[in-house]
């Protein structure tokens, strides 16, 4: 499952602002660690749509708040 918030770039770009994007090229299959690569047309650069539970420009960090929230839900 992909969360469109945040759509991580460098600097971060709010998902609502980014309406125009393309698929990233094949060369970028490893650009995002835990998420999907999207090529931002206006900025002319790749960015990452992080999978649920991950944050960071490349979705490289586990979202500790999400982890805590998920564990509290289970209890």
């Amino acid at each position: 499952e992909n969360s469109t918030s945040p759509l991580s770039a460098d600097p971060p770009v709010a998902a609502a602002v980014v309406s125009h994007f393309n698929d990233c090229p094949d060369s970028h299959t490893q650009f995002c660690f835990h998420g999907t690569c999207r090529f931002l047309v206006q900025e002319d650069k790749p960015a990452c749509v992080c999978a649920s539970g991950y944050v960071g420009a490349r979705c490289e960090h586990a979202d500790l708040l999400a982890v805590v929230a998920a564990s509290q839900k289970k209890q």
């Epitope: 460098d10 650009f31 790749p46």
Partner: antibody
Framework: VQLQQSGAELVRPGASVKLSCTAS????????MHWVKQRPEQGLEWIGR????????KYAPKFQDKATITADTSSNTAYLQFSSLTSEDTAVYYC?????????WGQGTTLTVSS | IQMTQSSSSLSVSLGDRVTITCKAS??????LAWYQQKPGNAPRLLIS???NLKTGVPSRFSGSASGKDYTLSITSLQTEDVATYYC?????????FGGGTKLEIK
Amino acid sequence: VQLQQSGAELVRPGASVKLSCTASGFNIKDDYMHWVKQRPEQGLEWIGRIDPANGHTKYAPKFQDKATITADTSSNTAYLQFSSLTSEDTAVYYCTRMGLRRGYWGQGTTLTVSS
Amino acid sequence: IQMTQSSSSLSVSLGDRVTITCKASEHINSWLAWYQQKPGNAPRLLISGATNLKTGVPSRFSGSASGKDYTLSITSLQTEDVATYYCQQYWGTPWTFGGGTKLEIK
């Protein structure tokens, strides 16, 4: 917005050399940085790339043991280092980053390997 | 991915409409660039993304795409356009370049 490369190099066979490419107007962490080779009177050949955000590299097989690409994000600079140089390495080397709407190429660095 | 420029050289006249073609061995989804190179100079990027003209490049240059076939057109050839033209795919790694098409005046 540009890529500025280091000056021409004349080196002896067997020596090593390190070429630099400094970006201005954009952050090299935004996307991969690539290096391309062009021998005199020849076509263009991809050497490899680096992801400056994490240092991950990928090389064309023929350059795997010859070239090393590195980056320093604090100076916004990518590097191409060669070891055990031979006359076959005499060429112009370009650093580049390509997008869908725009592309950036350095002016090229001429490397001459001669005794 | 192989990039094939069918003509290594073209004999042209000033004022001609010139078409240079490039064929990809696989789909590259318009991740294609065109370059102009003159002897002793660095390649000059003309077009990226198959159709996007780089700022400062004359409007007589244009790019088009159809499937795996890509075309660079020059509407009315000028003296300064005499050069070698290369296509390049940057969809996948390794990046690959066409062999070049050299324009020569008749």
